[in-house]
């Protein structure tokens, strides 16, 4: 029975050209995590595992960067950018748990910071 | 350098059994996950099998489930895959297969071939 | 289970063409496709992985691209060697699937 649950930083905004964290956290569940991959639409940004380490796509190497944790740095960020990305556990026993976070990178310099695990 | 050497093939008559055994080198075994893949002679490619690396929990193909077990001993850097209740349809070539980030196949055995046949 | 087809099933070109192999997935598979080259009597090698990084070792010629259901394998101008099978591969979910194999022969 999977128990757990994924807190997110939800929707949140930046400006163009700086930088953001996209955090999760797996709460509620004793399961092991194994890896979380990071996805962008479509996309697989970024993988994280217990045993190997992180590998960020070749095509991302640029402007994502590892952590801080299990999280996932997007840099010099572009309109583009602005999207849905997705946060996936895989856990053992419990299998896989999903979370989803929306950024929005806007033109100009009235981005919210009230995101909690956004850079202030 | 990695490597990755099956064997255990062989003829064995329908019914019967056979342990494949994939022996690795040149990289840290327990971190990765590994699968068994098959090809039949002159037909495509085809999974069968899947285990972890760190917890051991496995995956198989519909058409080998309840008849094969994956297995791997990190201690002695092998994988392995028995087989039993073989039936004619299982006789392909046999690979292993390491599997980083459970994503893409990197390396690959050279193969063991195994008949199932009377 | 997700079901991947490949086309064409085979093809005939000649050294220096630019060959495009396709491969589609029955339902979305974000960018967790591989492709692999076959040669015969010789275990399959890795080409590209999740869908447009290419491998360690692997000639630039060969590039990959596609998301969700639709994917392609691009090699830019054949080359003697290339004369093989290719197989795309889904790794989104158990069971894994491949396509039935593109056989690129020479004209």
């Known amino acids: 029975m999977m128990t757990g649950t994924i807190e997110t930083t939800g929707n949140i905004s930046a400006e163009k050209g700086g930088s953001i964290i996209l955090q999760c956290h797996l709460s509620s569940t004793t399961a092991q995590v194994t890896q979380v991959n990071w996805e962008q639409q479509d996309q697989l940004l970024a993988i994280c595992n217990a045993d190997l380490g992180w590998h960020i796509s070749p095509s991302f190497k640029d402007r994502v960067a590892p952590g801080p944790g299990l999280g996932l740095t997007l840099q010099s960020l572009t309109v583009n950018d602005t999207g849905e990305y997705f946060c996936i556990y895989h856990t053992y026993p419990d299998g896989t748990y999903t979370g989803r976070i929306f950024l929005e990178v806007l033109e100009s310099s009235v981005a919210e910071h009230g995101a909690r695990f956004q850079i202030p | 350098e990695v490597q990755l050497l099956e064997s255990g093939g062989g003829l064995v008559q329908p019914g019967g059994s056979l342990r494949l055994s994939c022996a690795a080198s040149?990289?840290?075994?327990?971190?990765?996950?590994m699968h068994w893949v098959r090809q039949a002679p002159g037909k495509g490619l085809e999974w069968v099998a899947s285990i972890s690396g760190s917890t051991s929990s496995s995956s198989y193909a519909d058409s080998v489930k309840g008849r094969f077990t994956i297995s791997r001993d990190n201690s002695k850097n092998t994988l392995y895959l028995q087989m039993n209740s073989l039936r004619a349809e299982d006789t392909a070539v046999y690979y292993c297969?390491?599997?980083?980030?459970?994503?893409?196949?990197?390396?690959w055995g050279q193969g063991t071939l195994v008949t199932v046949s009377s | 289970d997700i079901q991947m087809t490949q086309s064409p099933s085979s093809l005939s070109a000649s050294v220096g063409d630019r060959v495009t192999i396709t491969c589609r997935a029955s339902q979305s598979i974000s960018s967790y496709l591989n492709w692999y080259q076959q040669k015969p009597g010789k275990a399959p090698k890795l080409l590209i992985y999740a869908a447009s990084s290419l491998q360690s070792g692997v000639p630039s010629r060969f590039s990959g691209s596609g998301s969700g259901t639709d994917f392609t394998l691009t090699i830019s101008s054949l080359q003697p060697e290339d004369f093989a099978t290719y197989y795309c591969?889904?790794?989104?979910?158990?069971?894994?699937?491949f396509g039935g194999g593109t056989k690129v022969e020479i004209k």
């Open positions: 591969q889904q790794s989104y979910s158990t069971p894994l699937t």
């Open positions: 297969a390491r599997v980083p980030y459970d994503v893409w196949m990197d390396y």
């Open positions: 040149g990289f840290t075994f327990s971190s990765y996950s």
